[in-house]
């Protein structure tokens, strides 16, 4: 019961840490950036992944897709690649996990595979939630960057003067959200990795095998039963050997020499 | 890089009107403000308007009710109205756009400036 439980919260954390991963790729609000101040009027913009939009006091908004730029910063296409490997991870783990949930029966589908399928989809998000997590890091280490840089410089350019402006950068909500939703989807990822050990557990129950010699010259065959890990083929403890071999279960009989345990 | 080019400065009689326009050109990412500015012979340079890509309007005091400035986003091209046109608003006016950077700050373009001159 602890297992299906730990395995069902682990798939709706990471549902939901993935969810957010996806919104926070699309979300424009990255970064938010003053632009320009006045008694009257104040602009500012806020920039996303793909696109950059200007918002006014007065509620004008205007978005417009980088497509339009030359030269966008290599950290920027590095972010959206981390985001969307997070997202296809995180997808595909969403799938398998689907398949891999105690409570959903499938065909004559065992534990074994389906504690397969929950350790392949924990890692999944384990690593979808990583992705998202540098990916959000990675950005905001370059707003940072970026503002440090380029403090206020003054040159003359063609058909005039050049200024920089230093203007205030804040994180953007798609940051935290995205922060958010990475720890999410990488906690999902580690309760599906411990659900999947309770779905197979290590089952070391020997049982305990006389055997009788049909004769005096028959000698014991050893190594009569494997241990079964949940894994192998011999997970229901059947016989090896059948020559004068019963289980404890089949035939009581008194200690000798020739007993194995 | 942006080019600023200005241009409708000249002589003027008091009480006259000029037109200025200043169009950008070149590979940039957005205009998100427009604004002229004005030196007059030995003195700062001060604020007489500024227009933002939605079209808010800020006028200096010592123009304010006898200008209009006005832009077209799709041009990158501002215009600055002056109308009762006075003595002491002889000047150079220089044309000023702030152009986003995404990811970076903005920068701010200045242009040669084209003279103004009120005089009878």
């Known amino acids: 019961m602890a297992v299906t439980a730990c395995q069902g919260l682990g798939f709706v954390v990471s549902l939901i840490g993935i969810a957010g991963i996806i919104a926070a790729t699309c979300m424009d609000q990255w970064s938010t950036q003053d632009l320009y101040n006045n008694p009257v009027t104040a602009v500012f913009n806020y920039q996303g992944l793909w696109r950059s939009c200007v918002r006014e006091s007065s509620g004008f908004t205007e978005c417009r897709g980088y497509f339009t730029l030359l030269g966008l910063p290599a950290m920027l296409q590095a972010v959206r690649a981390l985001m969307i490997v997070g997202i296809v991870l995180g997808a595909i783990g969403l799938l398998v996990s689907i398949f891999a949930l105690k409570c959903i029966r499938i065909g004559s589908m065992e534990d074994s595979a389906k504690a397969n399928m929950t350790l392949t989809s924990g890692i999944m998000f384990i690593v979808s939630g990583l992705c998202a997590i540098a990916g959000v890091s990675v950005f905001a280490n370059m707003l940072v960057t970026n503002f440090w840089m380029s403090t206020a410089n003054m040159y003359t350019g063609m058909g005039g003067m050049v200024q920089t402006v230093q203007t205030r950068y804040t994180f953007g909500a798609a940051l935290f959200v995205g922060w958010v939703a990475g720890g999410l989807t990488l906690i999902g990822g580690v309760m599906m990795c411990i659900a999947c050990r309770g779905l197979a557990p290590e089952e070391t129950n020997y049982k305990a095998v006389s055997y009788h010699a049909s004769g005096h010259s028959v000698a014991y065959k050893p190594g009569g039963f494997k241990a079964s890990t949940g894994f192998g083929s011999n997970t229901k403890n059947k016989k090896i050997y059948d020559g004068g071999a019963r289980t404890e279960d089949e035939v009581q009989s008194y200690p000798s020499k020739h007993d194995y345990v | 890089e942006v080019q600023l080019v200005e241009s409708g400065g000249g002589l003027v009689q008091p009480g006259g009107s000029l037109r200025l326009s200043c169009a950008a050109s070149g590979s940039f990412f957005r205009i998100v403000m427009y604004g002229w500015y004005r030196q007059a012979p030995g003195k700062g340079r001060e604020l007489v308007a500024t227009i933002t890509r939605g079209g808010s309007t800020y006028y200096a005091d010592s123009m304010k009710g006898r200008s209009t400035i006005s832009r077209d986003n799709a041009k990158n091209t501002v215009y600055l109205q002056m109308n009762s046109l006075k003595p002491e608003d002889t000047a150079v006016y220089y044309c000023?756009?702030?152009?986003?950077?995404?990811?970076?700050?903005?920068?701010?373009?200045w242009g040669q400036g084209t003279l103004v001159t009120v005089s009878s």
């Open positions: 000023n756009v702030r152009v986003e950077v995404p990811f970076m700050q903005p920068n701010d373009y």
